[in-house]
Protein backbone atom coordinates (compact mmCIF):
# COMPACT_ATOMS: atom_id res chain seq x y z
CA UNK A 1 0.00 0.00 0.00
CA UNK A 2 0.92 3.68 0.13
CA UNK A 3 2.48 3.43 3.59
CA UNK A 4 4.80 0.66 2.42
CA UNK A 5 6.10 2.93 -0.33
CA UNK A 6 6.55 5.83 2.06
CA UNK A 7 8.38 3.63 4.57
CA UNK A 8 10.57 2.10 1.86
CA UNK A 9 11.61 5.58 0.86
CA UNK A 10 12.31 6.69 4.44
CA UNK A 11 14.59 3.80 5.39
CA UNK A 12 18.25 3.60 4.45
CA UNK A 13 18.72 2.68 0.79
CA UNK A 14 20.06 -0.88 0.47
CA UNK A 15 23.67 -1.34 -0.59
CA UNK A 16 24.50 -1.26 -4.26
CA UNK A 17 25.85 0.85 -7.10
CA UNK A 18 25.27 4.58 -7.38
CA UNK A 19 23.26 6.33 -10.05
CA UNK A 20 24.61 7.29 -13.43
CA UNK A 21 24.37 10.42 -15.50
CA UNK A 22 24.80 11.19 -19.18
CA UNK A 23 27.09 14.13 -19.77
CA UNK A 24 27.98 15.93 -22.96
CA UNK A 25 31.25 14.94 -24.61
CA UNK A 26 32.97 18.16 -23.60
CA UNK A 27 32.45 17.22 -19.93
CA UNK A 28 30.95 20.60 -19.14
CA UNK A 29 27.37 19.43 -18.99
CA UNK A 30 24.65 21.89 -19.81
CA UNK A 31 24.37 25.50 -18.78
CA UNK A 32 20.63 25.30 -18.31
CA UNK A 33 19.49 25.86 -14.75
CA UNK A 34 16.52 24.29 -13.03
CA UNK A 35 13.74 26.75 -12.31
CA UNK A 36 10.56 26.33 -10.28
CA UNK A 37 7.19 26.68 -11.99
CA UNK A 38 4.51 26.97 -9.34
CA UNK A 39 1.81 27.52 -11.98
CA UNK A 40 1.80 23.88 -13.13
CA UNK A 41 3.07 24.92 -16.56
CA UNK A 42 6.17 23.51 -18.20
CA UNK A 43 8.14 25.59 -20.71
CA UNK A 44 8.96 23.66 -23.89
CA UNK A 45 10.57 26.26 -26.10
CA UNK A 46 7.73 28.71 -26.54
CA UNK A 47 5.14 26.11 -25.52
CA UNK A 48 3.93 25.69 -21.94
CA UNK A 49 2.42 22.34 -20.97
CA UNK A 50 -0.39 22.52 -18.42
CA UNK A 51 -0.66 19.38 -16.27
CA UNK A 52 -4.11 20.30 -14.92
CA UNK A 53 -6.06 17.74 -16.98
CA UNK A 54 -3.89 14.68 -16.35
CA UNK A 55 -5.40 11.46 -15.02
CA UNK A 56 -3.72 11.72 -11.62
CA UNK A 57 -5.01 8.34 -10.39
CA UNK A 58 -3.40 6.55 -13.35
CA UNK A 59 -0.12 8.41 -12.81
CA UNK A 60 -0.20 7.54 -9.11
CA UNK A 61 -0.77 3.87 -9.96
CA UNK A 62 2.19 3.83 -12.37
CA UNK A 63 4.40 5.52 -9.79
CA UNK A 64 3.51 3.12 -6.99
CA UNK A 65 3.73 0.05 -9.24
CA UNK A 66 7.02 0.70 -10.95
CA UNK A 67 8.57 4.20 -11.08
CA UNK A 68 9.12 4.33 -7.31
CA UNK A 69 11.06 1.06 -7.41
CA UNK A 70 13.37 2.37 -10.15
CA UNK A 71 14.03 5.58 -8.22
CA UNK A 72 14.91 3.57 -5.11
CA UNK A 73 17.17 1.29 -7.16
CA UNK A 74 18.95 4.36 -8.55
CA UNK A 75 19.50 5.62 -4.99
CA UNK A 76 20.86 2.30 -3.73
CA UNK A 77 24.03 2.70 -1.70
CA UNK A 78 23.00 6.05 -0.24
CA UNK A 79 21.07 6.99 2.89
CA UNK A 80 17.81 8.91 2.68
CA UNK A 81 19.33 11.35 5.19
CA UNK A 82 22.26 12.15 2.88
CA UNK A 83 20.31 14.87 1.09
CA UNK A 84 17.95 17.62 2.20
CA UNK A 85 14.77 18.18 0.22
CA UNK A 86 14.96 21.72 -1.15
CA UNK A 87 12.35 21.42 -3.93
CA UNK A 88 8.67 21.33 -3.06
CA UNK A 89 5.30 21.52 -4.78
CA UNK A 90 1.88 22.74 -3.70
CA UNK A 91 -0.65 20.79 -5.79
CA UNK A 92 -0.81 17.93 -8.28
CA UNK A 93 -0.19 19.89 -11.51
CA UNK A 94 2.62 21.81 -9.79
CA UNK A 95 4.18 18.55 -8.54
CA UNK A 96 4.14 17.12 -12.07
CA UNK A 97 5.66 20.35 -13.38
CA UNK A 98 8.54 20.05 -10.92
CA UNK A 99 8.92 16.30 -11.56
CA UNK A 100 9.06 16.91 -15.33
CA UNK A 101 11.58 19.72 -14.90
CA UNK A 102 13.88 17.84 -12.54
CA UNK A 103 13.71 14.62 -14.57
CA UNK A 104 14.23 16.00 -18.06
CA UNK A 105 15.81 19.46 -17.88
CA UNK A 106 19.62 19.33 -17.74
CA UNK A 107 21.31 21.06 -14.80
CA UNK A 108 24.99 22.11 -14.65
CA UNK A 109 26.22 19.21 -12.52
CA UNK A 110 23.72 16.56 -13.62
CA UNK A 111 23.46 16.93 -17.36
CA UNK A 112 20.76 14.37 -18.02
CA UNK A 113 18.76 11.75 -16.18
CA UNK A 114 16.53 11.24 -19.20
CA UNK A 115 18.02 7.88 -20.24
CA UNK A 116 17.49 6.29 -16.83
CA UNK A 117 14.73 3.70 -16.50
CA UNK A 118 12.71 5.79 -14.05
CA UNK A 119 12.87 8.74 -16.46
CA UNK A 120 11.71 6.67 -19.43
CA UNK A 121 8.80 5.40 -17.36
CA UNK A 122 7.99 8.92 -16.16
CA UNK A 123 7.94 10.14 -19.75
CA UNK A 124 5.68 7.24 -20.74
CA UNK A 125 3.20 7.81 -17.93
CA UNK A 126 2.96 11.53 -18.65
CA UNK A 127 2.53 10.83 -22.38
CA UNK A 128 -0.22 8.32 -21.68
CA UNK A 129 -2.24 10.07 -19.00
CA UNK A 130 -1.76 13.79 -19.74
CA UNK A 131 -3.80 14.88 -22.76
CA UNK A 132 -1.63 16.32 -25.51
CA UNK A 133 1.65 15.87 -23.60
CA UNK A 134 3.09 13.46 -26.17
CA UNK A 135 2.75 16.09 -28.89
CA UNK A 136 4.96 18.49 -26.92
CA UNK A 137 7.64 15.77 -26.76
CA UNK A 138 7.99 15.14 -30.50
CA UNK A 139 10.48 17.93 -31.24
CA UNK A 140 12.15 17.52 -27.83
CA UNK A 141 12.80 13.83 -28.53
CA UNK A 142 14.24 14.55 -31.98
CA UNK A 143 16.59 17.17 -30.53
CA UNK A 144 17.73 14.84 -27.74
CA UNK A 145 18.62 12.06 -30.20
CA UNK A 146 21.11 14.39 -31.90
CA UNK A 147 23.15 14.82 -28.71
CA UNK A 148 25.74 12.12 -28.12
CA UNK A 149 26.04 11.14 -24.47
CA UNK A 150 28.37 9.16 -22.29
CA UNK A 151 27.77 7.85 -18.81
CA UNK A 152 29.31 9.43 -15.74
CA UNK A 153 28.25 9.01 -12.15
CA UNK A 154 27.82 12.17 -10.12
CA UNK A 155 26.75 12.77 -6.55
CA UNK A 156 24.71 15.71 -7.83
CA UNK A 157 22.50 13.32 -9.78
CA UNK A 158 21.88 11.29 -6.64
CA UNK A 159 20.84 14.49 -4.92
CA UNK A 160 18.53 15.36 -7.81
CA UNK A 161 16.88 11.93 -7.69
CA UNK A 162 16.47 12.31 -3.93
CA UNK A 163 14.58 15.55 -4.67
CA UNK A 164 12.46 13.64 -7.20
CA UNK A 165 11.48 11.07 -4.58
CA UNK A 166 10.36 13.91 -2.34
CA UNK A 167 8.29 15.47 -5.14
CA UNK A 168 6.63 12.17 -5.97
CA UNK A 169 5.80 11.62 -2.27
CA UNK A 170 4.29 15.09 -2.20
CA UNK A 171 2.29 14.28 -5.34
CA UNK A 172 0.86 11.17 -3.67
CA UNK A 173 0.04 13.09 -0.48
CA UNK A 174 -1.80 15.84 -2.37
CA UNK A 175 -3.71 13.09 -4.18
CA UNK A 176 -4.71 11.46 -0.88
CA UNK A 177 -5.99 14.78 0.48
CA UNK A 178 -8.29 15.18 -2.51
CA UNK A 179 -9.87 11.74 -2.11
Amino acid sequence: GLNDIFEAQKIEWHEGGGGSDYKDDDDKGSSHHHHHHSSGLVPRGSHMYDFTNCDFQKIEADYLRTISKDLITYMSGTKSTDFNNTVSCSNRPHCLTEIQSLTFNPTPRCASLAKEMFARKTKATLALWCPGYSETQINATQAMKKRRKRKVTTNKCLEQVSQLLGLWRRFIRTLLKKQ
Epitope: K58, A61, D62, R65, T66, R120, K121, K123, A124, T125, A127, L128, P131, G132, S134, E135, Q137, I138, T141
Partner: antibody, heavy 120, light 107 residues
Framework: QVQLVQSGPEVKKPGSSVKVSCKAS????????MHWVRQRPGQDLEWMGT????????DYNQNFKGRATITADKSTSTAYMELSSLRSEDTAVYYC?????????????WGQGTLVTVSS | EIVLTQSPGTLSLSPGERATLSCRAS??????VHWYQQKPGEAPRLLIY???QSISGIPDRFSGSGSGTDFTLTISRLESEDFAVYYC?????????FGRGTKVEIK
Protein backbone atom coordinates in the same frame (compact mmCIF):
# COMPACT_ATOMS: atom_id res chain seq x y z
CA GLN B 1 12.66 -4.78 -39.92
CA VAL B 2 9.66 -4.25 -37.66
CA GLN B 3 7.10 -7.05 -37.89
CA LEU B 4 3.86 -7.78 -36.06
CA VAL B 5 2.61 -11.25 -36.90
CA GLN B 6 -0.87 -12.19 -35.71
CA SER B 7 -2.42 -15.60 -35.15
CA GLY B 8 -4.70 -17.16 -37.73
CA PRO B 9 -8.46 -16.82 -38.33
CA GLU B 10 -10.90 -18.11 -35.73
CA VAL B 11 -14.49 -19.31 -35.89
CA LYS B 12 -16.28 -19.12 -32.53
CA LYS B 13 -19.70 -19.83 -31.07
CA PRO B 14 -21.71 -17.06 -29.40
CA GLY B 15 -20.96 -16.87 -25.67
CA SER B 16 -17.44 -18.30 -26.05
CA SER B 17 -14.05 -16.52 -25.89
CA VAL B 18 -11.27 -15.91 -28.36
CA LYS B 19 -7.59 -15.13 -27.73
CA VAL B 20 -5.64 -13.47 -30.53
CA SER B 21 -1.84 -13.22 -30.38
CA CYS B 22 0.55 -10.70 -31.90
CA LYS B 23 4.23 -11.61 -32.10
CA ALA B 24 6.55 -8.60 -32.36
CA SER B 25 10.05 -8.55 -33.80
CA UNK B 26 12.60 -6.05 -35.09
CA UNK B 27 12.36 -3.58 -32.20
CA UNK B 28 12.60 -3.31 -28.42
CA UNK B 29 9.24 -4.62 -27.21
CA UNK B 30 9.12 -2.56 -24.00
CA UNK B 31 9.65 0.75 -25.80
CA UNK B 32 6.20 0.48 -27.35
CA UNK B 33 2.62 0.04 -26.23
CA MET B 34 0.57 -2.55 -28.07
CA HIS B 35 -2.85 -1.35 -29.15
CA TRP B 36 -5.74 -3.42 -30.42
CA VAL B 37 -8.12 -2.06 -33.03
CA ARG B 38 -11.02 -3.90 -34.63
CA GLN B 39 -12.87 -3.42 -37.89
CA ARG B 40 -16.25 -4.98 -38.47
CA PRO B 41 -17.14 -5.92 -42.07
CA GLY B 42 -17.48 -2.74 -44.13
CA GLN B 43 -17.17 -0.63 -41.00
CA ASP B 44 -14.77 1.85 -39.39
CA LEU B 45 -11.80 1.30 -37.13
CA GLU B 46 -12.58 0.96 -33.42
CA TRP B 47 -9.91 1.26 -30.72
CA MET B 48 -10.29 -1.50 -28.12
CA GLY B 49 -7.46 -0.91 -25.70
CA THR B 50 -3.75 -1.09 -25.08
CA UNK B 51 -1.09 -2.79 -22.98
CA UNK B 52 2.06 -0.87 -22.03
CA UNK B 53 4.88 -3.35 -21.25
CA UNK B 54 7.20 -0.63 -19.89
CA UNK B 55 4.68 0.23 -17.16
CA UNK B 56 2.94 -3.15 -16.90
CA UNK B 57 -0.41 -1.46 -17.28
CA UNK B 58 -3.36 -1.43 -19.65
CA ASP B 59 -6.25 0.79 -20.63
CA TYR B 60 -9.52 -0.09 -22.32
CA ASN B 61 -12.29 1.42 -24.34
CA GLN B 62 -15.32 1.39 -22.01
CA ASN B 63 -17.27 -0.38 -24.76
CA PHE B 64 -15.08 -3.45 -24.17
CA LYS B 65 -14.32 -3.14 -20.44
CA GLY B 66 -15.05 -6.39 -18.68
CA ARG B 67 -15.05 -8.35 -21.95
CA ALA B 68 -11.60 -7.57 -23.35
CA THR B 69 -8.34 -8.46 -21.63
CA ILE B 70 -5.05 -7.29 -23.13
CA THR B 71 -1.81 -8.82 -21.86
CA ALA B 72 1.75 -9.40 -23.00
CA ASP B 73 4.57 -11.86 -22.49
CA LYS B 74 7.74 -9.77 -22.49
CA SER B 75 9.99 -12.84 -22.70
CA THR B 76 8.56 -13.75 -26.10
CA SER B 77 7.62 -10.21 -27.24
CA THR B 78 4.05 -11.35 -27.75
CA ALA B 79 0.87 -9.43 -26.99
CA TYR B 80 -2.55 -11.01 -26.51
CA MET B 81 -6.12 -9.81 -26.75
CA GLU B 82 -8.84 -11.99 -25.28
CA LEU B 83 -12.49 -11.18 -25.90
CA SER B 84 -15.14 -13.05 -23.94
CA SER B 85 -18.94 -13.44 -24.15
CA LEU B 86 -18.73 -13.27 -27.93
CA ARG B 87 -21.75 -12.22 -29.95
CA SER B 88 -22.35 -12.05 -33.69
CA GLU B 89 -21.52 -8.30 -33.70
CA ASP B 90 -17.97 -9.21 -32.64
CA THR B 91 -17.34 -10.69 -36.09
CA ALA B 92 -14.49 -8.48 -37.26
CA VAL B 93 -10.86 -8.23 -38.24
CA TYR B 94 -8.76 -7.57 -35.14
CA TYR B 95 -5.49 -5.67 -35.56
CA CYS B 96 -2.58 -5.14 -33.19
CA UNK B 97 -0.54 -1.96 -33.65
CA UNK B 98 2.52 -0.71 -31.81
CA UNK B 99 2.88 2.83 -30.48
CA UNK B 100 6.00 4.39 -28.99
CA UNK B 101 5.58 5.48 -25.37
CA UNK B 102 8.82 7.46 -24.97
CA UNK B 103 9.05 8.71 -28.57
CA UNK B 104 6.98 8.85 -31.81
CA UNK B 105 3.69 8.27 -29.90
CA UNK B 106 1.79 6.98 -32.92
CA UNK B 107 0.62 3.63 -34.29
CA UNK B 108 3.34 3.28 -36.90
CA UNK B 109 3.29 -0.49 -37.49
CA TRP B 110 0.31 -2.85 -37.70
CA GLY B 111 -0.23 -6.59 -37.73
CA GLN B 112 -1.83 -8.21 -40.76
CA GLY B 113 -5.13 -8.64 -38.94
CA THR B 114 -6.97 -11.67 -37.57
CA LEU B 115 -10.48 -12.44 -38.77
CA VAL B 116 -12.73 -13.64 -35.96
CA THR B 117 -16.09 -15.01 -37.07
CA VAL B 118 -18.80 -15.50 -34.45
CA SER B 119 -21.51 -17.79 -35.69
CA SER B 120 -23.82 -20.44 -34.29
CA GLU C 1 -15.03 10.63 -25.79
CA ILE C 2 -13.62 12.76 -28.61
CA VAL C 3 -15.62 12.37 -31.83
CA LEU C 4 -13.84 12.83 -35.16
CA THR C 5 -16.04 13.76 -38.12
CA GLN C 6 -14.55 13.19 -41.57
CA SER C 7 -15.81 14.80 -44.73
CA PRO C 8 -16.69 14.14 -47.41
CA GLY C 9 -17.69 10.50 -46.99
CA THR C 10 -16.66 9.82 -50.59
CA LEU C 11 -14.45 11.83 -52.91
CA SER C 12 -14.62 11.04 -56.65
CA LEU C 13 -11.55 12.32 -58.46
CA SER C 14 -9.33 11.54 -61.43
CA PRO C 15 -5.62 10.69 -61.31
CA GLY C 16 -3.52 13.87 -61.27
CA GLU C 17 -6.15 15.84 -59.37
CA ARG C 18 -5.74 17.31 -55.91
CA ALA C 19 -7.58 15.67 -52.99
CA THR C 20 -8.50 17.57 -49.83
CA LEU C 21 -9.83 15.51 -46.92
CA SER C 22 -11.20 17.06 -43.74
CA CYS C 23 -11.30 15.83 -40.14
CA ARG C 24 -13.07 17.82 -37.42
CA ALA C 25 -12.75 17.05 -33.71
CA SER C 26 -15.58 17.53 -31.19
CA UNK C 27 -13.16 19.35 -28.86
CA UNK C 28 -9.73 20.97 -28.93
CA UNK C 29 -7.04 18.32 -29.46
CA UNK C 30 -4.07 20.55 -30.27
CA UNK C 31 -2.19 18.72 -33.07
CA UNK C 32 -2.69 15.16 -31.84
CA VAL C 33 -4.19 13.85 -35.08
CA HIS C 34 -2.76 11.14 -37.32
CA TRP C 35 -3.78 10.03 -40.80
CA TYR C 36 -3.91 6.45 -42.14
CA GLN C 37 -4.54 4.93 -45.54
CA GLN C 38 -6.33 1.60 -45.86
CA LYS C 39 -6.79 -0.51 -48.95
CA PRO C 40 -9.21 -3.49 -49.16
CA GLY C 41 -7.91 -6.53 -47.30
CA GLU C 42 -4.95 -4.63 -45.83
CA ALA C 43 -4.08 -3.12 -42.48
CA PRO C 44 -4.06 0.66 -42.14
CA ARG C 45 -0.80 2.43 -43.03
CA LEU C 46 0.41 5.55 -41.26
CA LEU C 47 0.79 8.56 -43.58
CA ILE C 48 1.06 11.66 -41.36
CA TYR C 49 1.43 12.02 -37.60
CA UNK C 50 0.76 14.91 -35.24
CA UNK C 51 -1.19 16.78 -37.91
CA UNK C 52 1.71 17.58 -40.23
CA GLN C 53 4.74 15.40 -39.46
CA SER C 54 5.85 13.36 -42.47
CA ILE C 55 6.80 9.69 -42.39
CA SER C 56 9.86 8.32 -44.16
CA GLY C 57 8.86 6.18 -47.11
CA ILE C 58 5.57 8.04 -47.63
CA PRO C 59 5.52 10.05 -50.90
CA ASP C 60 5.74 13.80 -50.36
CA ARG C 61 2.50 14.36 -52.27
CA PHE C 62 0.83 13.55 -48.93
CA SER C 63 0.75 16.46 -46.49
CA GLY C 64 -1.21 17.38 -43.41
CA SER C 65 -2.20 20.60 -41.70
CA GLY C 66 -4.42 22.01 -38.97
CA SER C 67 -4.61 22.29 -35.20
CA GLY C 68 -7.23 22.65 -32.49
CA THR C 69 -10.35 21.10 -34.02
CA ASP C 70 -9.88 21.29 -37.80
CA PHE C 71 -7.43 19.11 -39.73
CA THR C 72 -6.74 18.48 -43.39
CA LEU C 73 -4.98 15.77 -45.36
CA THR C 74 -3.97 16.87 -48.86
CA ILE C 75 -2.85 14.64 -51.72
CA SER C 76 -1.33 17.07 -54.21
CA ARG C 77 -1.57 14.88 -57.32
CA LEU C 78 -3.48 11.62 -57.10
CA GLU C 79 -1.73 8.49 -58.33
CA SER C 80 -3.57 5.27 -59.14
CA GLU C 81 -2.34 3.64 -55.90
CA ASP C 82 -3.82 6.48 -53.80
CA PHE C 83 -7.42 5.39 -54.30
CA ALA C 84 -8.30 4.00 -50.89
CA VAL C 85 -10.01 4.86 -47.61
CA TYR C 86 -8.37 7.47 -45.36
CA TYR C 87 -8.89 7.64 -41.60
CA CYS C 88 -7.95 10.30 -39.08
CA UNK C 89 -7.24 9.25 -35.49
CA UNK C 90 -6.70 11.22 -32.28
CA UNK C 91 -4.23 10.33 -29.54
CA UNK C 92 -4.92 13.43 -27.45
CA UNK C 93 -6.66 11.41 -24.74
CA UNK C 94 -8.12 7.98 -24.05
CA UNK C 95 -10.16 6.41 -25.46
CA UNK C 96 -8.38 6.87 -28.76
CA UNK C 97 -10.88 7.37 -31.57
CA PHE C 98 -10.96 7.21 -35.35
CA GLY C 99 -13.02 9.12 -37.88
CA ARG C 100 -15.47 7.21 -40.06
CA GLY C 101 -13.19 7.47 -43.06
CA THR C 102 -13.17 9.17 -46.46
CA LYS C 103 -13.20 6.94 -49.51
CA VAL C 104 -11.21 8.37 -52.41
CA GLU C 105 -12.48 6.68 -55.56
CA ILE C 106 -11.71 7.00 -59.26
CA LYS C 107 -14.11 9.29 -61.09
Amino acid sequence: QVQLVQSGPEVKKPGSSVKVSCKASGYIFTDYAMHWVRQRPGQDLEWMGTFIPLLDTSDYNQNFKGRATITADKSTSTAYMELSSLRSEDTAVYYCARMGVTHSYVMDAWGQGTLVTVSS
Amino acid sequence: EIVLTQSPGTLSLSPGERATLSCRASQHISRSVHWYQQKPGEAPRLLIYFASQSISGIPDRFSGSGSGTDFTLTISRLESEDFAVYYCQQSYSFPYTFGRGTKVEIK
